[in-house]
Interface confidence: medium
Amino acid sequence: MMTGTIETTGNISAEKGGSIILQCHLSSTTAQVTQVNWEQQDQLLAICNADLGWHISPSFKDRVAPGPGLGLTLQSLTVNDTGEYFCIYHTYPDGTYTGRIFLEVLESSVAEHGARFQIP
């Protein structure tokens, strides 16, 4: 039975040209995390594998940085980065857990950070 839950940074906003940290945290399960995938709609941004470490998709290498922890940092944001982001936790023996984050990249100089909290 899958008992775990994923906490995420929820709906967040950031300024164009700035950076943002996407974070998810899997709790309430003793399952082993074997891999975490970060995806934007249907595009793979990065993978953190328990044995092979991090892999950043070549097309995002200049704008995506791993961490902190299993999170992902998006840099040099553009309005086109607005959209849904998913953290997909592959675990054993539970299976797959998915968390959703909605990022809005604003043109304005004041981006309100709604539902933003720090997960280690």
Epitope: C48, P66, G67, T73
Partner: antibody
Amino acid sequence: QVQLQQSGAELVKPGASVKLSCKTSGYTFTSYWIQWIKQRPGQGLGWIGEIFPGTGTTYYNEKFKGKATLTIDTSSSTAYMQLSSLTSEDSAVYSCARSRDGKVVDYWGQGTSVTVSS
Amino acid sequence: DVQMTQTTSSLSASLGDRVTISCRASQDISNFLNWYQQRPDGTVKLLIYYTSKLHSGVPSRFSGSGSGTDYSLTIRNLEKEDIATYFCQQGNTPPYTFGGGTKLEIK
């Protein structure tokens, strides 16, 4: 097998700088974080910071900002830490270590002893 | 910063004994607790990560447990090669802080 080979012991004068190296082998250098840890006798271990060779991203412990600078050379799979404006408080053994996600260090270098003395 | 406290700085035990080393965090660290072994020659090895998961190649006589702020490392059937200093480390919140270490000696 995974190995992190650090440079030899250093004796440096107060006010000087020193650059320590950590040559890695046995794994894909650009896929793991390299962390640096300080150990002084009787004072335990202190986390200095980490660098991700795949992107050059760094995170520092606030206590070491301005003191330590972390860099990498991907062509030789080597990580470096430069320590500046050295004082006797910087005399310690400095270790590099490999980490998948920052939360766990799975392999350590053998450490480099730095002695600051006039 | 999260403070990590190992109240016992040194411990003496006999070969074959069961030994428990404790570590306390100043706040809840959500099981992100690692144990490292530092041999007298300075070599450091990861033993346990995420409270209770055994690192590859580590003998099964080592085990870890705990939650919240209190954690422990247990060594069953103590062997000569286990003579070392043991450090706990929290990986929950940067900067990742270490305990002061517990030096294990043979009686």
